[in-house]
C-alpha cells in the first residue's frame, strides 16, 4: 500500500503484497522407481509421489515427468533428502584383496533445467564416499538452500545410482520447494 | 485486498494478509535427558529447552512435555539435527569375531501426533548404519521439510537410542518449526 | 491494516506488512580459500563468493570479509553445507599401528558475532568423526535452523580444517540466510 495516504504510519510495504497461503509449494515423496533411459554421463532422475500420503503440490506448483515446474519467478527454498542403502561397497572388498581402494560413492544433485538454456544447472550436490565395514549399510544425504528461479524453470533430483535409493518409506526420501 | 477499489493496480493479494513477525515459530535446543518410560516398539522422544540460550517459542507456538504444539493450520517448515556419539559399535566387534555383521544404526524421526487419529505419523526419518572403525565416533543427522499441519497437531523428535544423543551443546542438537 | 475501518472482516493483519521480495537474503558459494591467520584455539572462517554464478545478496544483506551482515532485526533461517575431502585419516593409520584410536574429525560451525558482545556465539555445529577405510574420502556436513538476529549481527562459517574443504564446485559448499 506504498504511498497511500490511508496507510498507517508504521506500515512498511515496499512492493506488491502476497498472502503466504497463495504461494507455490510442493513436498514430494519417494516412490518405487520404474526403469527409464538416461544419458550415459548423466545421473538418472528420480520420479516422485505428488499427492498421496504426505505429498502435495499447491498454488500452481505442478509435478510432471520427474520435474517440479516453477510457476512464477522468485526466491525459492529447495530441499531434498535421499536415503541410500546397499551391500558392502567394492571399496572394502578391494581393500581386503590388498588392491588400491578407490572408494565407491553416493551422490544427490538437485538440478535446474531452463528451456532457453542448453545445459542443466546443478544447484545443490551432496556426495559421499562409501567405504563401509558392515555388509549392509544405509545413510541419508540431505540438501537445502535458497535460489532465485524463473517462471518455467524445472527442478529434478538426480542420483548416482537409482538401485541404491531406499523407496520404502515416504519419510526417508523426499524433495520439496516453496516460494519465500 | 482483492477486489477493493482502493488497492493499487499492482496489488497482488489473494487471501487474508499476515504480518510475518506474527507467525508461530520455535527453535528448541538439547537438554540432558531424564530417563522416561516409552513403549517397547516405539523410539523414545527427546525433551527440549524452549527459552534459555538460543531457544525460543513465539506467537502461540508452545512447547510442553516433549511436544511442540501447532497453534494454527498451515504449511510449516520443520527441522531437527541430532548429534549422536558412541563407542565402537557392536557391528565392528562382531565383524572382528567373524560373526555375521548386522550393522548398528542411529535414527531420528520427526513425528506428528493428531488427537483425532490413533496412530502417530512419521513425517521425517534420518537413519544411518554405524559400523565405525574408531573407538569413539560422533556424527549428526539433519532433517528438514515442509508439511501441512492442522491446529492442535503435536510434533516430537524420536531417536533410536537416547543414551547416544549428544546433549552437551545447544548448537549440536536442536529442533524447530515455523509457519511459512 | 490493523484497526482500519476499510479492512474487510476476514483481514488478519496484526503488524506492519512486508512484501516478501523486499526481505534481506543471501546465498553464498565456495571459493578457493587464501591462507589467513586465525587464533590458535579458534576454527578458521571461510570466505565466500557473493555474486558470481548461483551466489547473490539482496535487500541490504551484504557480504564483507567472511561475514554476512544482518541489516535488520528479525527471525532468519540460516544454512550451510561444507563438503570435506581428504586422504586416509590418521585414525585408521593409528589403528593399524596398534595405538589408541582417537578419531579425526571434521566440524562446521555457523557463528554469530555481535559487536557489543565480546564472545562470538556458536549458532549451529555439525561435527563428525572421520575414520575412513578408503584412501580418499569425501562427505558433506549440512546445517540449517532459525535464529532471532539483531541489526548489525554478523554471521560466518568456521571449519576445523580449511585444507579439507572442497572448493571445486559452487553446489557442494555454500552458506545462506534469509529473513522469514
Amino acid at each position: 500500500l506504498k504511498g497511500q495516504e490511508f496507510a498507517p504510519s508504521h506500515q512498511q510495504v515496499y512492493a506488491p503484497l502476497r498472502a503466504d497461503g497463495d504461494k507455490p509449494r510442493a513436498h514430494l515423496t519417494v516412490v518405487r522407481q520404474t526403469p527409464t533411459q538416461h544419458f550415459k554421463n548423466q545421473f538418472p532422475a528420480l520420479h516422485w509421489e505428488h499427492e498421496l500420503g504426505l505429498a502435495f503440490t499447491k498454488n500452481r506448483m505442478n509435478y510432471t515427468n520427474k520435474f517440479l515446474l516453477i510457476p512464477e519467478s522468485g526466491d525459492y527454498f529447495i530441499y531434498s533428502q535421499v536415503t541410500f542403502r546397499g551391500m558392502t561397497s567394492e571399496c572394502s572388498e578391494i581393500r581386503q584383496a590388498g588392491r588400491p581402494n578407490k572408494p565407491d560413492s553416493i551422490t544427490v544433485v538437485i538440478t535446474k533445467v531452463t528451456d532457453s538454456y542448453p545445459e542443466p544447472t546443478q544447484l545443490l550436490m551432496g556426495t559421499k564416499s562409501v567405504c563401509e565395514v558392515g555388509s549392509n549399510w544405509f545413510q541419508p544425504i540431505y540438501l537445502g538452500a535458497m535460489f532465485s528461479l524463473q517462471e518455467g524453470d524445472k527442478l529434478m533430483v538426480n542420483v548416482s545410482d537409482i538401485s541404491l535409493v531406499d523407496y520404502t518409506k515416504e519419510d526417508k526420501t523426499f524433495f520439496g520447494a516453496f516460494l519465500l | 485486498l482483492k477486489g477493493q477499489e482502493f488497492a493499487p493496480s499492482h496489488q497482488q493479494v489473494y487471501a487474508p494478509l499476515r504480518a510475518d513477525g506474527d507467525k508461530p515459530r520455535a527453535h528448541l535446543t538439547v537438554v540432558r535427558q531424564t530417563p522416561t518410560q516409552h513403549f517397547k516398539n516405539q523410539f523414545p522422544a527427546l525433551h527440549w529447552e524452549h527459552e534459555l540460550g538460543l531457544a525460543f517459542t513465539k506467537n502461540r507456538m508452545n512447547y510442553t512435555n516433549k511436544f511442540l504444539l501447532i497453534p494454527e493450520s498451515g504449511d510449516y517448515f520443520i527441522y531437527s539435527q541430532v548429534t549422536f556419539r558412541g563407542m565402537t559399535s557392536e557391528c565392528s566387534e562382531i565383524r572382528q569375531a567373524g560373526r555375521p555383521n548386522k550393522p548398528d544404526s542411529i535414527t531420528v524421526v520427526i513425528t506428528k501426533v493428531t488427537d483425532s487419529y490413533p496412530e502417530p505419523t512419521q513425517l521425517l526419518m534420518g537413519t544411518k548404519s554405524v559400523c565405525e572403525v574408531g573407538s569413539n565416533w560422533f556424527q549428526p543427522i539433519y532433517l528438514g521439510a515442509m508439511f501441512s499441519l492442522q491446529e492442535g497437531d503435536k510434533l516430537m523428535v524420536n531417536v533410536s537410542d537416547i543414551s547416544l544423543v549428544d546433549y552437551t551443546k545447544e548448537d549440536k542438537t536442536f529442533f524447530g518449526a515455523f509457519l511459512l | 491494516l490493523k484497526g482500519q475501518e476499510f479492512a474487510p472482516s476476514h483481514q488478519q493483519v496484526y503488524a506492519p506488512l512486508r512484501a516478501d521480495g523486499d526481505k534481506p537474503r543471501a546465498h553464498l558459494t565456495v571459493v578457493r580459500q587464501t591462507p589467513t591467520q586465525h587464533f590458535k584455539n579458534q576454527f578458521p572462517a571461510l570466505h565466500w563468493e557473493h555474486e558470481l554464478g548461483l551466489a547473490f545478496t539482496k535487500n541490504r544483506m551484504n557480504y564483507t570479509n567472511k561475514f554476512l551482515l544482518i541489516p535488520e532485526s528479525g527471525d532468519y533461517f540460516i544454512y550451510s553445507q561444507v563438503t570435506f575431502r581428504g586422504m586416509t585419516s590418521e585414525c585408521s593409520e593409528i589403528r593399524q599401528a596398534g595405538r589408541p584410536n582417537k578419531p579425526d574429525s571434521i566440524t562446521v560451525v555457523i557463528t554469530k558475532v555481535t559487536d557489543s558482545y565480546p564472545e562470538p556465539t556458536q549458532l549451529l555445529m555439525g561435527t563428525k568423526s572421520v575414520c575412513e577405510v578408503g584412501s580418499n574420502w569425501f562427505q558433506p556436513i549440512y546445517l540449517g535452523a532459525m535464529f532471532s538476529l539483531q541489526e548489525g549481527d554478523k554471521l560466518m562459517v568456521n571449519v576445523s580444517d580449511i585444507s579439507l574443504v572442497d572448493y571445486t564446485k559452487e553446489d557442494k559448499t555454500f552458506f545462506g540466510a534469509f529473513l522469514l
Epitope: 499427492e51 498421496l52 500420503g53 509435478y63 515427468n65 520427474k66 515416504e170 | 505419523t121 | -
Partner: antibody
Framework: QVQLQQSGPGLVKPSQTLSLTCAIS??????????WNWIRQSPSRGLEWLGR?????????DYAVSVKSRITINPDTSKNQFSLQLNSVTPEDTAVYYC?????????????WGQGTLVTVSS | DIQMTQSPSSLSASVGDRVTITCRAS??????LNWYQQKPGKAPKLLIY???SLQSGIPSRFSGSGSGTDFTLTISSLQPEDFATYFC?????????FGQGTKLEIK
C-alpha cells in the same frame, strides 16, 4: 501377474449396507507402490471413483465427496484383500462396482480391474 | 475437482479408418492422462498411460498425445475388435475422474 477377484451380494435393500470384498493375488494390499480402489459404473453417472486405501508410512483412506459420509474401505493384510462398505443405500447406488489397483511409480493408472459386480438396490 | 470432457460421445467408422477421440480436462493434469477400452459386460482395459505410453500387449495402432488440458487418442487403422467404448481418466489429482466415454460403432 496381479489379479483381483470380487465377491459380495448382487442385491441390497434400500437403507441397508452394501458390502463387497476384493481379493488380491500377485501383489500385497500393504505395498507402498499401489493404491486399492473402488469404482462404480452406471448409465446415469458413468465411471465414478469412490475411494481408495493405501499404505505409505501409515494407512491412508481417501473417499469421494459424494459418498464420504457413507463409505468405508478397509484393507485386511492377513487375507490380502480390501473391502467396500456403503451404508444407507438408495436405488441411485445401483451400479456395476469394480475394484482396481492403481500403480504408483511415477506414472499411475488402474490395472488390473476386478471382474465387476452388478449391485442392484431394490426392495 | 477436475472434470473430464470427451468428444465425440459416439462415433461411426469403418474398418481401416483413422479415428481420433479428444479429451479435455477442466484444469491441467500435466501428463497424467490414461485411456481405457471397455467392451460390453467387461471391465475397462488400459490402453495408454501418461498421455502417450502404450501399455504392453496393446497394438501399436493405438497412440496418445497431449499434455496439460488437451489430449487425443488415435487409432491409426481400425480393426473389427476395436469397436468398443473408450474412456479417458486423469490420475493427477484426487478424486480420480473419467470422461463420459466415446462409443465407437461400425458404420
Amino acid at each position: 501377474q496381479v489379479q483381483l477377484q470380487q465377491s459380495g451380494p448382487g442385491l441390497v435393500k434400500p437403507s441397508q449396507t452394501l458390502s463387497l470384498t476384493c481379493a488380491i493375488s500377485g501383489d500385497s494390499v500393504s505395498s507402498n507402490s499401489a493404491t486399492w480402489n473402488w469404482i462404480r459404473q452406471s448409465p446415469s453417472r458413468g465411471l465414478e471413483w469412490l475411494g481408495r486405501t493405501y499404505y505409505r508410512s501409515k494407512l491412508y483412506n481417501d473417499y469421494a465427496v459424494s459418498v464420504k459420509s457413507r463409505i468405508t474401505i478397509n484393507p485386511d493384510t492377513s487375507k490380502n484383500q480390501f473391502s467396500l462398505q456403503l451404508n444407507s443405500v438408495t436405488p441411485e447406488d445401483t451400479a456395476v462396482y469394480y475394484c482396481a489397483r492403481e500403480v504408483v511409480a511415477g506414472p499411475r493408472w488402474f490395472d488390473p480391474w476386478g471382474q465387476g459386480t452388478l449391485v442392484t438396490v431394490s426392495s | 475437482d477436475i472434470q473430464m470432457t470427451q468428444s465425440p460421445s459416439s462415433l461411426s467408422a469403418s474398418v481401416g479408418d483413422r479415428v481420433t477421440i479428444t479429451c479435455r480436462a477442466s484444469q491441467s493434469v500435466t501428463s497424467y492422462l490414461n485411456w481405457y477400452q471397455q467392451k460390453p459386460g467387461k471391465a475397462p482395459k488400459l490402453l495408454i498411460y501418461t498421455a502417450s505410453s502404450l501399455q504392453s500387449g496393446i497394438p501399436s495402432r493405438f497412440s496418445g498425445s497431449g499434455s496439460g488440458t488437451d489430449f487425443t487418442l488415435t487409432i491409426s487403422s481400425l480393426q473389427p475388435e476395436d469397436f468398443a467404448t473408450y474412456f479417458c481418466q486423469q490420475s493427477y489429482s484426487t478424486p480420480r475422474s473419467f470422461g463420459q466415454g466415446t462409443k465407437l460403432e461400425i458404420k
